[in-house]
Structure formats: C-alpha cells, structure tokens
C-alpha cells in the first residue's frame, strides 16, 4: 500500500493576511486565523513529517480584499510560488479582470501547473494561451505518479469576464476523455481538482470513471468528522464518500473558504491504484500555529503599497452620498442607489442575444450601509471612504429566486418599519410601493421589476412563479437580518466580488458620480 497526503485550499479570495474568525479584517492578532504565513508553517510541518504530500488549490484565489484590487493577481502567483503549491484549478473569479488579467499576472508567473479540462480556447486566444493552463498534469510524488485533472464552473461566463474566446464545456463530458487518456498512459491514481461546487463535485465522483478523489471548491463547503473547531457548521463528514456508478467509494473534499482551514486528507492506495482507505479533517489555522517569519516579512513588505493605495482618489462625487442610517433604514437613499447601480454594472454579461443582460435586479440591506460620504472634500472618494461605508468585507453575490421569495423579502423589509432596523431594502432594477397602514406581511402593494429578456428595458409586475436572478450581499444570501426566506428558498447561489471593489471599480469607471433619489421605493396609503 502507498499513502498520499493531500493538503488543499479553495476560495481563499485574497486573504493573504490573517483574518478575524469571520474572515474579515484582523483586529485582535491573538485571535486571528489563516493567512499565507500561518498556512506555510502548517504545510511545512506536514511536509517534514510525511513522505508523499501534495498541496493543491481548487480555485478562486482571486478577488476579495484590497490585495487583489491593488496587485491584480501578482500577489497570488508570488505567495503560491513561495508556498510551493503543486497545482491549482481555475475558478470563476480568476477571470474577473478578463483573460489578460489571468494570463499576465498568474498563468505566466506561476511555477506550478494551473488546470482546467473543460475550458477550451478558440480564435486568436488559442495560440496566446496555449500551454499556460492544462487539462491535466502528472506529478511525481515520492516514487509514484499522481494525475490531476482540473475543472471550472461552466457558469463562469455569467459570473465573471472570460470573454468570447473561451468555451466552458460540461464538466463531466470534458473530464472523462482526459481521465481515459491518463489511464492509457498508465497513471492509476487520479485526483479531480476543480471549482464547480459541492453538488458537481459529487456528480464527478459518481460519473467520471477512473477518478479516485475529488477536491473541490466554489460552494465554500465545510465538511468535518467529529466536533467542529470553530463556528462553521459541517455540511457532511470529511471526506464525504460517494459511491461511483462503477461501485467504487470516492472521497470528496472541500475546505470551506478564505484560508481559514487547510484541508488534510490521507489516502491509501493499493498497487493497482485503488483507494483502500481515506481519512482526515480540515485543520483550523488558528493562532496556536505561528506565522512563518520569512513569509510574514514578505507580506509586510507587500503591504506598504496597499496603505498608499487606500488614500488615493478613485473618482469624484458632486452630490452628498447619503449613507446615514436615518435615511437608508427608512427610505430610498442615494448611497443605496449608487451601490446597487455598481452591483448591476459589475454583472453586465452579454451572453445571449435575447437578453440585454442576464440580471437586472439588486437588493441591499440598508443596515449594511455604514457611513455617508461628504462631497465637500473636493468631491474626492477614496478606498478608505468606501471602507467606512462597507466595512464588513462582504461580497455581492448572484442568486436565483422565485418571485414569491422576493415578495416575502420585501414584506420582511418593512415588517417592523420605523425602528431603524437594518433589514430595510435598498434596490436597483426594482420599483416597490409599500402601504404601511396595512398589517405586517401584507404591506407590499406594488412590485415591478426590470425585464432582462428585452431590447428596451422596462418595468413589469413581478410574477410569483417566475425565477429571477438577483444581485445581493452575501450577508442576505446567507439569511442575515432575518432574511431566512432567501437562504431557505434560493435556487442557486454563486459568490461574487468584494463589495468595496465593486463600488470602487464603478466609481473609477464613471469618474464623476451624482446618484439621485428617483422613486425606486415609494410609500402610499389607501387603495391600489
């Protein structure tokens, strides 16, 4: 028998520095977690103790903090090289700055293979990107070889900016021939490493003949066997065992997100490459694990540029940006409108001639807007200003919801109106009218939504049974501020870009902004 240790991360999202327990900015260092310096300490400890170790990343290193905003992926290549990752799969967020923003900083600089079997380049891009990412890679591990096949969410064109010269194929259809090729080359230990979410990971384990282990990402799934060490609630045991269609037991793993945990899976193979046993657990990277001094020093060196960036002007406002709780928790506020407009703008994807865009709606809890921005400072808007407005380090995500769920969300928005509570919704691509004289749960008297399958966008009444795409903060997607109906009833959830980054990019693009209060949210009394 031969034993392999798989160390894995996924959805790190720019958390190069240690973070607080909820993966936001580290405040009290003695209670902080994760970060590449701490990760390196643990990885090195395991490499010294065990003979056959692979360090893998299942995608979405890009996007999430000011590190990515400033360094645009160069930081990912640099620190992943320093940690000596063995392989990485492409995630949807790796395309956030377009194909060029992937090729130059990451693909050309990485000293490890970057993988995806279901992304096919065409046209002029095919020769430019050839060999920079691969469908599979065979790695020597000790005296054996291990094949790693990559995959990426086929929804990437709706979630990021891969352009028109990359085709995202069905994962299972694309993986099978690559695994078959590895088998013909006498590779009998094969890991599928990819970024399509836990449901697809399980399907790959079930359907792709010859895959021995699946290491996934995208859904931020936390798996754990025994008593979990922090706040995350396990979605199942680690590893999650899937019985394949040909009768094999295939371990499937994922390691939550944000570099908080290091996935740790031990696999025992027989001489023919069959999995005999698998066991492990994610390792919580808490403060009991010291940060590696040399990596930490490097982080501090790179950090200097971030501090300079946060005080530079992104653009100007010629109006007061009202982000006060007195406005945003009670009525339409222009800061809410600005943020929602930025959220929609960030999700412009012309992937179908029938649709002007795939999504037109935004909702945003007023309690998430934490500060106004005064225009009387020469109109200057900086990253620092935006960090005061959006201090929680969240993301603006894409969900699919039924009209009936949206109706419940808007009822919840005003169910206890007047108490300055955070659940009051700011909107984009939505016209809502409330009648506060009616009883809670029956206060939405008009709800019109902007069409997407149209050449001239216009507002139509919400249909209860129709499925709509909506951009919203991850806080709401996870049921925050009492929006349990969103969490319980959402049909799909894809994590998006860092909130501040979305707004800062929009302001930089617009150069001068002047958001108004324009009647998106109205109040009425009497009959309708």
């Amino acid at each position: 028998a031969w034993e392999l240790t798989i160390l894995h991360t996924n959805d790190v999202h720019s958390r190069l520095e240690q973070t607080s327990e909820d993966s936001s900015k580290c405040v009290n260092a003695s209670r902080c977690m994760g970060g590449v310096a701490r990760l390196f300490t643990k990885v090195q400890q395991i490499r010294r103790a065990e003979p056959n170790v692979l360090l893998l990343d299942a995608g979405d290193q890009y996007q999430g903090t000011i590190w990515f905003t400033v360094y645009k992926g160069a930081e990912v290549a640099h620190f992943m090289n320093a940690l000596r990752y063995d392989a990485m799969a492409l995630g949807n967020h790796e395309f956030d700055n377009g194909v060029e923003g992937l090729i130059e900083p990451l693909l050309k600089e990485a000293k490890f293979p970057i993988l995806s079997a279901n992304i096919k380049a065409k046209g002029p891009l095919a020769s430019q990107i050839s060999g920079l990412y691969l469908p599979y890679k065979v790695l020597p591990v000790g005296d054996e070889v291990v094949g790693i096949v990559g995959y990426t969410s086929k929804e990437t064109p709706f979630l990021s900016n891969p352009g028109t010269n990359l085709v995202f194929e069905d994962e299972i259809t694309a993986l099978q021939p690559e695994v078959d090729k590895l088998k013909t080359l006498n590779v009998n230990k094969i890991i599928a490493l990819g970024h399509s979410g836990f449901e697809m990971d399980k399907l790959i384990a079930q359907k792709v003949r010859g895959v021995d282990v699946v290491v996934g990402g995208h859904s931020n799934t936390f798996l754990y066997t025994g008593n979990p060490p922090s706040k995350e609630v396990p979605a199942g045991k680690y590893p999650f065992i899937v019985t394949s269609d040909d009768g094999r037991k295939v371990p499937v793993v994922q390691a939550y997100a944000f570099g908080k945990y290091l996935g740790y899976l031990k696999i025992e193979f027989d001489e023919r490459g069959n999995v005999i046993s698998s066991h492990g657990n994610p390792i919580l990277l808490n403060s009991s694990i010291p940060e590696d001094p040399s990596i930490k020093a490097d982080i501090n060196k790179w950090r200097i540029k971030l501090d300079n960036y946060s005080t530079q002007e992104l653009g100007k406002t010629i109006v007061y940006l009202d982000g006060s709780s007195q406005s945003c928790r009670f009525r339409e506020c222009n800061m809410g409108n600005l943020i929602c407009d930025a959220m929609i703008n960030n999700n412009l994807r012309h992937t179908d001639e029938m649709f002007w865009n795939h999504v037109s709606m935004c909702i945003l809890n007023g309690g998430g807007i934490r500060s106004p921005i005064d225009e009387r400072n020469n109109g200057t808007i900086t990253w620092e200003n935006l960090a005061a407005v959006l201090p929680f380090g969240g993301t603006f995500d894409l969900v699919q919801l039924k009209g009936s769920t949206l109706k419940k969300a808007f009822e919840h928005s005003v169910h206890r109106y007047g108490q300055s509570t955070g659940e009051f919704l700011q909107v984009g691509g939505i016209h809502v009218v409330y009648d506060l004289s009616r009883k809670p749960g029956d206060r939405v008297v008009k709800l019109d939504v902007l069409c997407t399958k149209c050449r001239v966008p216009s507002y139509d009444p919400l249909k209860m049974d129709e499925v709509y795409k909506v951009i919203l903060p991850n806080f709401l997607a996870n049921g925050g501020d009492g929006f349990q109906m969103i969490k319980d009833e959402l049909l799909r959830h894809d994590s998006g870009d860092q909130d501040i980054n979305v707004v800062s990019t929009y302001i930089s693009k617009m150069k001068v902004i002047y958001p108004a209060v324009e009647g998106r949210i109205k109040f009425s009394t009497g009959s309708h």
């Epitope: 293979p113 691969l134 890679k137 065979v138 020597p140 005296d143 080359l185 006498n186 590779v187």
Partner: antibody
C-alpha cells in the same frame, strides 16, 4: 513504429561543450518522459538523466549534475543533452531512450551516438 | 545511493539449458526493477519490467521474479539468440541505476 535517432556526437576536448540531439517519431512524443543513458567503451550501462513528458521535471545522475542539462522541444519531437565541462570519463556511446511507464520501463532505445573526450 | 550487484558475472551454458541470473539491491526497490538484454554492437532491449512483467514481443521463456532487494531473471530454455549481456536496473526517487551485467555465453 517507434524510432529514436541520436546525433551530435564527436570528439571534444576536456572542459569544452557538446550538444546531443535525438529526433523521435512513431509515437506521441509529448506524452512520454525521455532519458539519456550512456555506455563507456567495453563497460556497462550508466543512466544519465530523465526529463518529464512536458519538461517540467528533470533528474540527473550525480556524476553529471551541474554539468549536463537535459531539455526537450515537444513541438519538434526532439530531445537534447547539453554537455558542459566535459571530462575524459564522459567518453561513451550516448543512447536516447523512451520512458514507457513513469520510470518503470525504458522501452525503446536509439542506436546511440559516440562522444569522445580527449585532448 | 542504491547499488546494484549481479551474479554471476559470467554464466556459461549450452542451448536448451535453464539460465538463472541474480540481481541484488543494496536497499529495497519495491517493484521498480527491470531487465535488459544487450548484444554486441546493439542498443539494449527491454525484457522485463516491474520485476515480473514481460515487455511486448518478449518470448515466454523469459520470466522475472523477486521483490524488495532480491530479483531473478530466468530463461527456461536457452536459444542461440539469447547469448548476450543482461542488465538489471532499478529506480528509486527518480534516480536510476544499472547493475554491472551478467554475460551469458556458450559453454
């Protein structure tokens, strides 16, 4: 059928350099690791170097480490051996060899090219 | 570094006889052992890999056995074309070493 044809052998002075090439045909070159193995006149076989199918990993015998460099061009189906700081003991027939299965079998051998290091 | 030894250095036999060649490694090489045949003026030819698997086109009279440190190549009945030098070869951590060879000549 698999064919491996070495070239570039000849006489070189000690301390000088020589470059060997191996043209491969009859198989998908980019799928296979490749080796150089040498045999001094009247002696046994000595492994020299291995390069991974895509050129990403290289391994060398201690006797040549730091002096010899193995490389490949998959677009040209060609394997190379750059030999620097040559010594008399590098005199040998150099064989280009296909790795048939991840180091467990060296399954196809070229006919070899003779390198003579002499002043 | 793993050192390979082969015995005997020379084996003198007649056609039709059984030949047993031995190869010993200075430390365990698991199953990563191969046997090659070389005739004068020719390149070596793969006979056996992974200690006991016959390469494509190799006659059934050639067989390999052993594991760990001790390995054997057996030629059940020598044919005239089998008189040659036989080398064993191991791989450990992607470093390869050959034994010094056993010469099988006609008695």
């Amino acid at each position: 059928q698999v064919q491996l044809v070495e070239s570039g052998g000849g006489v070189a002075q000690p301390g000088r350099s020589l470059s060997l090439s191996c043209a491969a045909s009859g198989f998908t070159f980019s799928d296979y690791g490749m080796h150089w193995v040498r045999q001094a006149p009247g002696k046994g076989l000595e492994w020299v170097a291995l390069i991974w199918y895509d050129g990403s990993f290289e391994y060398y015998a201690d006797s040549v480490k730091g002096r010899f460099s193995i490389s490949r061009d998959n677009s040209k189906n060609t394997l190379y051996l750059q030999m620097n700081s040559l010594r008399a003991e590098d005199t040998a027939v150099y064989y280009c060899v296909r790795d048939g299965q991840w180091g467990s079998r060296l399954d196809y051998w070229g006919q070899g090219t003779l390198v003579t290091v002499s002043s | 570094k793993i050192v390979m030894t082969q015995s005997p250095a020379t084996l003198s036999l007649s056609p039709g006889e059984r030949a047993t060649l031995s190869c010993r490694a200075s430390q365990s090489v698991s199953r990563y052992l191969a046997w090659y045949q070389q005739k004068p003026g020719q390149a070596p030819r793969l006979l056996i890999y992974d200690a006991s698997n016959r390469a494509t086109g190799i006659p059934a009279r050639f067989s390999g056995s052993g594991s760990g440190t001790d390995f054997t190549l057996t030629i059940s009945s020598l044919e005239p074309e089998d008189f040659a030098v036989y080398y064993c070869q191991q791989r450990s951590n992607w470093i390869f070493t050959f034994g010094p060879g056993t010469k099988v000549d006609i008695k």
